[in-house]
């Protein structure tokens, strides 16, 4: 015998309370395949979430984040505040990168500048809060008389370690 529920199309569910007739999914719910005995719950995009795709009777909503925030987690399950380049987000808000670290994006953490000397290279361009250092050729590669740009170590700036 064929299961009567198998005839219920997407957007409906097989209602056991009504002799297994196909009933439309209630508001704010959906079924993406036929033959379902329950409808799934639509995702709601509220607060810092913004609707990228509305829920329909056959497919779930999709959310992204309002301006000033970016998605984190599976399926944009969280929205995290953007910071400026040269900053990272801590529990106390956006904080400037400590001296010797940088962040070239509006999200993520400050990362240490590349240590050029580990690769036997010299610093060609100094690092900033927003940009990594640029390493130049190793001193041995330089033609006689040429000198690498090795700046004096600047005074340490007050930094903020992540809370």
């Amino acid at each position: 015998l064929q299961d009567p529920c198998s005839n219920c199309p997407a957007g409906t569910f097989c209602d056991n309370n009504r002799n297994q007739i196909c009933s439309p999914c209630p508001p704010n719910s959906f079924s993406s395949a036929g033959g379902q005995r329950t409808c799934d719950i639509c995702r709601q995009c509220k607060g810092v979430f913004r609707t990228r795709k509305e829920c329909s009777s056959t497919s779930n909503a999709e959310c992204d984040c309002t301006p000033g925030f970016h998605c984190l987690g599976a399926g944009c399950s969280m929205c995290e505040q953007d910071c400026k380049q040269g900053q990272e987000l801590t529990k106390k808000g956006c904080k400037d990168c400590c001296f010797g670290t940088f962040n070239d994006q509006k999200r993520g953490i400050c990362r240490p500048w590349t240590n050029c000397s580990l690769d036997g290279k010299s610093v060609l361009v100094n690092g900033t809060k927003e940009r990594d250092v640029v390493c130049g050729p190793s001193p041995a590669d330089l033609s006689p008389g040429a000198s690498s740009v090795t700046p004096p170590a600047p005074a340490r700036e007050p930094g903020h370690s992540p809370q």
């Epitope: 993406s32 329950t38 719950i41 709601q44």
Partner: antibody
């Protein structure tokens, strides 16, 4: 669509157990959260852990589960797992897997549960 | 951590009665609240989601209301099949270091 748990049984304190939750009628490539919820005998429901069975596989744990329990999945088998280590008497419960499509811990599909008994 | 407090813990009622169960969240959870019914030896069954939306296949005598921290489940006319334990659940995904999701302690609706 259904979820079927297995792997429960009697285990000694300090022992380990791996529970399975087999899904049918929907694909683990879908954008669902599947979670483990437990219920001690005669007590209420307690949320334990969740995993996103879409591409990212993000995981979340209740404080009571962190460090001892690990949630994982095998998409090729459409199966979810809960690895439980260093079990204690207070972990004795019926363990349910449940599915959420809302991202807000609202479960419209539940398994029948599997009983875990921790006793010497 | 999010804490859900349900009251009363036990409720005695008769068929045909109007029954109200309350649930309080320790912090504002907007309308991210669900209600479940559970019978002995069975898995919970979703009744209400987003505080007031009726789940598929659930009779219209069940209704939910509230937002923020105060929520209510109402059964307009209690039926023999409704004697069970009811749980509220609130929660949302934040970050792996600070995840919120909690059930209330349950309300057992028994025959008076």
């Amino acid at each position: 669509q259904s979820l079927v748990e297995s792997g429960g049984g009697l285990v000694q304190p300090g022992g380990s157990l791996r529970l399975s939750c087999a899904a049918s009628g929907f694909s683990f490539s879908s954008n669902y959260w599947i979670c483990w919820v437990r219920q001690a005998p005669g007590k209420g429901l307690e949320w334990i852990a969740c995993i996103y069975v879409g591409s990212s596989g993000d995981t979340y744990y209740a404080s009571s589960a962190k460090g001892r329990f690990t949630i994982s999945r095998d998409n090729s088998k459409n199966t979810l797992y809960l690895q439980m280590n260093s079990l204690r008497a207070e972990d004795t419960a019926v363990y349910y897997c449940a599915r959420d499509s809302s991202s807000y811990y609202m479960f419209n599909l539940w398994g029948q549960g599997t009983l875990v008994t921790v006793s010497s | 951590a999010l804490v859900m407090t349900q009251s009363p813990s036990t409720l005695s009622a008769s068929v045909g009665d109007r029954v109200t169960i309350n649930c309080q969240a320790s912090e504002d959870i907007d309308t991210y609240l669900a209600w479940y019914q559970q019978k002995p030896g069975k898995a919970p069954k979703l009744l209400i989601f987003y505080a007031s939306d009726l789940a598929s296949g659930v009779p219209s005598r069940f209704s939910g209301s509230g937002s923020g921290t105060e929520f209510t489940l109402t059964i307009s006319s209690l039926q023999p099949d409704d004697f069970a334990t009811y749980y509220c659940q609130g929660g949302y995904y934040t970050s792996s270091a600070d995840t919120r999701g909690a059930f209330g302690g349950g309300t057992k609706v028994e025959i008076k």
